[in-house]
């Protein structure tokens, strides 16, 4: 028998420095977790102790903190090279800065193979990107070879900016011929490494003949066997075992997100490359693991540029940006409008001639807006200003909801109106009218939404049975501020871009902003 140790990360999202337990900015260092310096310590410890070790990443290194905003992927290549990753799969967020923003900082600089079998380049891009990412790679490990085949969410064109010259094929259809090719090369140990979410990971394990292990990402799935070491609740055991259609037991793993854990899977293969056994658990990268001093010194060196960036002007406002709780928790506020407009703008994707855009709606809990910005400081808006408005380091995500769920969400928005609570919703692409004289749960008297399947966008009444795409904070998608109906009833959830980054990009693009209060939210009683 031959034993392989797979170390894996996914959805690191720019968390190069250690973070707090909830993956936001580290405040109390003695309680902080993750970060590449700590990850390196643990990886090196395992490499020294065990003979056959692979370090893999299942995508979405890009996007999530000021590190990505400033360094645009160069930081990913540099520190993944320093940690000596063996392979990476492309995630949807690797396309956030377009194909050029993937090629230049990452594909050209990575000292490890970057993989995806279901992304096919066409047109002028085909030759430009040829060889820079691969469908699979055969890696020597000890005296054996292991095939790694990559895959990426086929929803990427709706979630990021891959352009028109990349075709995202069905994962299973694309993977099978590449796995077959590896078999003809006498590679009998094959890992599928990819970024399509846990449900697709399980399908790949079930349907793709010849795949021995699936290492996934995208859904931030936490798997654990035994008592979990932190706040994350396991979605199943680690590894999650899927019985394939041809009767094999295929381990499927994922390691939550944000570099908080290092996935650790030990696989035993027989001489024919069949999996005999698999066991392991994610390792919590808490403060009991020291940060590697040389990587930490490198992080501190790269950090300097970030501190300079946060005080530079992004753009100007010529109006007061009212982000006060007195406004945003009670009525339409122009800071809410600005943020929602930025959220929609960040999700403009012309993927279908029938639609002017795939999504037109935004909702945002008023309690998530934490500060106003005064225009009397020469109108200057900096990253620092925006960090005061959006201090939680969240993301603006894409969900699919039924109209009935949205209606419930708007009822929840005003179910205890007047107590300055955070659930009051700010909106974009939505016109809502409340009647507060009615009883809670029946206060929404009008709810019109902006059409997407139209050449001239206009507002139509919400249909209860229709499925709508909505951009909202991850906090709401996860049921925060009491929006349990969103969490329970959402039909799809894809994590998006860092909140501050979305707004800062929009302000930089617009240069001068002047958001107004324009009647998106109205009250039909005389007292408002």
């Amino acid at each position: 028998a031959w034993e392989l140790t797979i170390l894996h990360t996914n959805d690191v999202h720019s968390r190069l420095e250690q973070t707090s337990e909830d993956s936001s900015k580290c405040v109390n260092a003695s309680r902080c977790m993750g970060g590449v310096a700590r990850l390196f310590t643990k990886v090196q410890q395992i490499r020294r102790a065990e003979p056959n070790v692979l370090l893999l990443d299942a995508g979405d290194q890009y996007q999530g903190t000021i590190w990505f905003t400033v360094y645009k992927g160069a930081e990913v290549a540099h520190f993944m090279n320093a940690l000596r990753y063996d392979a990476m799969a492309l995630g949807n967020h690797e396309f956030d800065n377009g194909v050029e923003g993937l090629i230049e900082p990452l594909l050209k600089e990575a000292k490890f193979p970057i993989l995806s079998a279901n992304i096919k380049a066409k047109g002028p891009l085909a030759s430009q990107i040829s060889g820079l990412y691969l469908p699979y790679k055969v890696l020597p490990v000890g005296d054996e070879v292991v095939g790694i085949v990559g895959y990426t969410s086929k929803e990427t064109p709706f979630l990021s900016n891959p352009g028109t010259n990349l075709v995202f094929e069905d994962e299973i259809t694309a993977l099978q011929p590449e796995v077959d090719k590896l078999k003809t090369l006498n590679v009998n140990k094959i890992i599928a490494l990819g970024h399509s979410g846990f449900e697709m990971d399980k399908l790949i394990a079930q349907k793709v003949r010849g795949v021995d292990v699936v290492v996934g990402g995208h859904s931030n799935t936490f798997l654990y066997t035994g008592n979990p070491p932190s706040k994350e609740v396991p979605a199943g055991k680690y590894p999650f075992i899927v019985t394939s259609d041809d009767g094999r037991k295929v381990p499927v793993v994922q390691a939550y997100a944000f570099g908080k854990y290092l996935g650790y899977l030990k696989i035993e293969f027989d001489e024919r490359g069949n999996v005999i056994s698999s066991h392991g658990n994610p390792i919590l990268l808490n403060s009991s693991i020291p940060e590697d001093p040389s990587i930490k010194a490198d992080i501190n060196k790269w950090r300097i540029k970030l501190d300079n960036y946060s005080t530079q002007e992004l753009g100007k406002t010529i109006v007061y940006l009212d982000g006060s709780s007195q406004s945003c928790r009670f009525r339409e506020c122009n800071m809410g409008n600005l943020i929602c407009d930025a959220m929609i703008n960040n999700n403009l994707r012309h993927t279908d001639e029938m639609f002017w855009n795939h999504v037109s709606m935004c909702i945002l809990n008023g309690g998530g807006i934490r500060s106003p910005i005064d225009e009397r400081n020469n109108g200057t808006i900096t990253w620092e200003n925006l960090a005061a408005v959006l201090p939680f380091g969240g993301t603006f995500d894409l969900v699919q909801l039924k109209g009935s769920t949205l209606k419930k969400a708007f009822e929840h928005s005003v179910h205890r109106y007047g107590q300055s609570t955070g659930e009051f919703l700010q909106v974009g692409g939505i016109h809502v009218v409340y009647d507060l004289s009615r009883k809670p749960g029946d206060r929404v008297v009008k709810l019109d939404v902006l059409c997407t399947k139209c050449r001239v966008p206009s507002y139509d009444p919400l249909k209860m049975d229709e499925v709508y795409k909505v951009i909202l904070p991850n906090f709401l998608a996860n049921g925060g501020d009491g929006f349990q109906m969103i969490k329970d009833e959402l039909l799809r959830h894809d994590s998006g871009d860092q909140d501050i980054n979305v707004v800062s990009t929009y302000i930089s693009k617009m240069k001068v902003i002047y958001p107004a209060v324009e009647g998106r939210i109205k009250f039909s009683t005389g007292s408002h």
Epitope: N81, K108, K111, G131
Partner: antibody
Framework: QVQLVQSGAEVKKPGASVKVSCKAS????????MHWVRQAPGQRLEWIGN????????KYNEKFKSRVTITVDKSASTAYLELSSLRSEDTAVYYC??????????WGQGTTVTVSS | DIQMTQSPSSLSASVGDRVTITCRAS??????LTWFQQKPGKAPKSLIY???ILLDGVPSRFSGSGSGTDFTLTISSLQPEDFATYYC?????????FGGGTKLEIK
């Protein structure tokens, strides 16, 4: 297949400059960095610098920084190495090499530069 | 700069022999080491990058191992076309630096 074809041998006087070319074919020129390396008689190989053909970004060995310029002509899929203020110790074979995964991987056939008065 | 020390500087062997060449770095270079072959008057030919990954078309009798500061190139069964000079280079950090070479001659 990947091919790097370098210009012919050069004989130069001390103090002069030399410009060596490296024409790439068999791949998209702008997609890979290009290294330049030299090998002087009886000496170990020396890395001179490299260039990103898509944007002209360069990295140079400090030893050569004041005298070397690496450029590209994207339309001709050609990289150039220019070395000025030549001295006898610059007599060497100069190689271009395509960079893959950070490392020089595919090499040109070399250009002999002789510096002699 | 990182110094690369190769040994031996020359080596005599016969067809079919197993040969090992070593390369030592003056500091940790992770696994970022390439081996290449050069024959007189010819362009260098890279064989292995990142310590142990063979470039396309390189025969499987060539293999590499090591990490940190100590690395080896092994040719499992020498063929007539393998007699040449072998070099290592590190690309962990700039400037890229080279070993002094090992000349492999027919015994």
């Amino acid at each position: 297949q990947v091919q790097l074809v370098q210009s012919g041998a050069e004989v130069k006087k001390p103090g002069a400059s030399v410009k060596v070319s490296c024409k790439a074919s068999g791949y998209t020129f702008t997609s890979y960095w290009m290294h330049w390396v030299r090998q002087a008689p009886g000496q170990r190989l020396e890395w001179i610098g490299n260039i990103n053909p898509s944007n002209g970004g360069t990295k140079y060995n400090e030893k050569f920084k004041s005298r070397v310029t690496i450029t590209v002509d994207k339309s001709a899929s050609t990289a150039y190495l220019e070395l000025s203020s030549l001295r006898s110790e610059d007599t060497a074979v100069y190689y271009c090499a395509r960079r893959d995964y950070g490392s020089p991987s595919y090499w040109g056939q070399g250009t002999t530069v002789t510096v002699s008065s | 700069d990182i110094q690369m020390t190769q040994s031996p500087s020359s080596l005599s062997a016969s067809v079919g022999d197993r040969v090992t060449i070593t390369c030592r770095a003056s500091q940790d270079i992770n696994s970022y080491l390439t081996w290449f072959q050069q024959k007189p008057g010819k362009a260098p030919k890279s064989l292995i990058y990142r310590t142990n990954i063979l470039l396309d078309g390189v025969p499987s009798r060539f293999s590499g191992s090591g990490s940190g500061t100590d690395f080896t190139l092994t040719i499992s069964s020498l063929q007539p076309e393998d007699f040449a000079t072998y070099y290592c280079l590190q690309y962990h950090e700039f400037p890229v630096t080279f070993g002094g070479g090992t000349k492999l001659e027919i015994k």
